[in-house]
């Protein structure tokens, strides 16, 4: 029922206003102008984005499960936002914990050699039967973001005349016959079809793909960043280890592929104020327009400190713009002096290729512990994971609409294959909510000083962070 407010007495209007003020505490606000779609609705719940007809409807909405859940999340968010700034001792303790973890959980040069030897051995085995193929190590082993137990990612480069599925079937047969490998199986239904086996000597799991060029390019990019930016590798290792502790890094179980965590760290370092990493494309490129960023394709790493790009004007955006321009020209009076914006842009984009630096000129002075905390805060409070896309190519924040990707869960753009959301394996809302909740718990845990025996906490123990960052020492500060 809609009340005719003009007929209310002053006392009744006071009562209504009082009720509305109370509703505001629950994030339900009176609409100044009614929405054309919801003409009967007088109120809007800003938390749940729901239109509500009247006060009674608002009281009913407040009791709903989703509203209560959103209220709790909002309360937790404001609690997290009001956490005190960490002391320098706290940050120093965090820095030590991250460095120790990187040493303890990351792979050493010896571990890397073992992994390279595995590829060498496998090359010999496979090339005996397929001499035109070559094998290369890629993924976390090469970037040095691998944890000691991480799989060994191997890709087979093969000539165009060979058939991809047939090749993998042959590889499956070859490895099955070899005494060097056990538990040889195929996983041809995976997003990237692979042959999986265990190296008998090292007991490491190997995942053998074929023609996985994009993954190799991403590997090269991340490996180069690890070499030029000292904080990158320890941050990625800490982030990956945290994800492993929380069981959110298993792609097959609906989690996030492990290299996504490296892209997330990279994106954070680009977006923080001031940034510690540059974006890969930007206004330093003559004729660059963020609206037409897909005309610029990343092509790989050069000199270990630049990313190569190419301008390709035959992309879909160009065709659309030309079509629009032609339509506009047809509607215009003839005028030879007039140049459309598209003409200018086409001329401006003179540079057909170039390279972008992977580092900023100013050296980083930010303590590692502070960056770890900022990273958790960024994904807990500052960056709306459901709304935007994690895109390391440009400084502008991309919305889901920009990419035509649905508005939910996590979207991470593959910098070398821009139509791919590399986090699409996280496809359950429940898992997404668990990931968000883990971020909150982690930020709370690391933002609050921890005592040696562990803090007495009123938090639900099941919700507490599973294990501390370093298995040697708990984070401690004065």
């Amino acid at each position: 029922t809609v009340i005719d407010e003009s007929a209310l007495t002053p006392e009744q209007r006071l009562g209504l206003k009082q009720a509305e003020e109370r509703l505001e505490r629950d994030h339900i606000f009176r609409l100044e102008k009614r929405s054309p779609e919801y003409t009967n609705c007088r109120y809007l719940c800003k938390l749940c984005l729901i239109h509500i007809e009247n006060i009674q409807g608002a009281h009913k909405h407040i009791k709903e499960k989703r509203h209560k859940k959103n209220i709790l999340e909002k309360q937790e968010e404001s609690e997290l936002r009001s956490l005190p700034s960490p002391s320098s001792a706290h940050l120093a303790a965090l820095s030590v914990a991250v460095v120790e973890l990187a040493k303890e959980q990351g792979i050493t040069d010896d571990d890397l050699r073992i992994r390279q030897d595995i590829v060498e051995e496998m090359s010999k085995v496979i090339m005996t039967f397929l001499p035109e193929c070559s094998l290369r190590l890629y993924g976390s082993s090469l970037t040095k973001f691998a944890l000691k137990s991480s799989d060994v990612n191997i890709d087979i480069k093969f000539p165009p005349k060979m058939n991809h599925p047939d090749l993998l079937i042959q590889v499956l047969g070859i490895l099955k016959k070899s005494a060097l490998y056990i538990d040889v199986e195929s996983d041809f239904h995976a997003k990237v079809p692979v042959v999986v086996c265990k190296d008998r000597k090292s007991a490491l799991l190997c995942r053998v793909s074929a023609g996985n060029d994009m993954a190799c390019l991403t590997t090269d990019l991340l490996a180069a960043l690890g070499k030029v930016e000292p904080v990158f590798t320890p941050l990625v290792l800490a982030f990956r280890y945290w994800a492993k502790l929380c069981y959110i890094d298993s792609q097959t179980d609906g989690g996030i592929p492990s290299y996504c965590f490296a892209l997330m760290v990279m994106f954070f370092l680009q977006q923080r104020k001031p940034p510690l990493l540059p974006c890969l494309l930007g206004s330093w490129i003559e004729g660059f327009d963020p609206k037409r960023m897909d005309d610029f394709q990343l092509k790989g790493i050069v000199e270990e400190k630049f990313v190569k790009w190419e301008y390709n004007s035959s992309s879909a955006t160009e065709k659309n713009l030309i079509a629009d321009e032609n339509k506009a020209k047809a509607d215009e009076p003839k005028d030879d002096t007039k140049k459309t914006e598209t003409d200018n842009q086409s001329n401006a984009a003179k540079a057909k290729h170039g390279k972008s630096p992977l580092t900023l000129e100013a050296p980083n002075q930010v303590p590692l512990g502070q960056l770890w905390l900022e990273l958790l805060k960024f994904y807990t409070l500052d960056f709306a994971l459901e709304e935007y896309v994690i895109c390391v190519r440009i400084q502008d924040i991309l919305t889901r609409e920009n990419k035509n990707w649905p508005k939910r869960r996590i979207a991470i753009e593959d910098p070398f294959s821009v139509k791919r959301n590399v986090a699409r394996s996280l496809n359950s809302q429940l898992v997404y909510e668990y990931v968000v909740e883990r971020f909150r718990a982690a930020y709370r845990y690391f933002a609050c000083p921890q005592k040696k025996g562990g803090n007495k906490s009123t938090m639900d123990p099941k919700k507490k962070e599973k294990g501390k960052l370093s298995s040697k020492k708990p984070v401690k500060s004065d």
Epitope: E11, L14, G15, K17, Q18, A19, E21, R22, R25
Partner: nanobody, 118 residues
Framework: QVQLQESGGGLVQAGGSLRLSCAAS????????MGWYRQAPGKEREFVAG???????YYADSVKGRFTISRDNAKNTVYLQMNSLKPEDTAVYYC????????????WGQGTQVTVSS
């Protein structure tokens, strides 16, 4: 338990002014409305003025332009400034506070007498 203590009432000549105060003690929650009512002998209690926690004010037509309600949230106190008083304003003035949200006002003071002589 909430106690409301009114003060400032008295005898005043027509055209004069008075300022009533009402201090609330006990558990007063944010978002409580506070108001003033009055009851003249042989008449029903009537609404005079009210103010929400956010500061929105409402007046009975008979007092609009002459009375001003205000509040000090820090002190949990509500005031009623009464100017250009008329003999028909003579009544016992009651302070009221809203806590439960079910009734508009659910706690009432003892009242303070205001007499306007002609």
């Amino acid at each position: 338990q909430v106690q409301l203590q009114e003060s400032g009432g008295g005898l005043v000549q027509a055209g004069g002014s008075l300022r009533l105060s009402c201090a609330a003690s006990g558990t007063i929650f944010q978002s409580t409305a506070m108001g003033w009512y009055r009851q003249a002998p042989g008449k029903e209690r009537e609404f005079v003025a009210g103010i929400t926690f956010g500061g929105s004010t409402y007046y009975a037509d008979s007092v609009k332009g002459r009375f001003t309600i205000s509040r000090d949230n820090a002190k949990n106190t509500v005031y009623l400034q009464m100017n250009s008083l008329k003999p028909e304003d003579t009544a016992v003035y009651y302070c009221a506070v809203s806590l439960s949200g079910v009734e508009l006002f659910d706690y009432w003071g003892q009242g303070t007498q205001v007499t306007v002589s002609s």
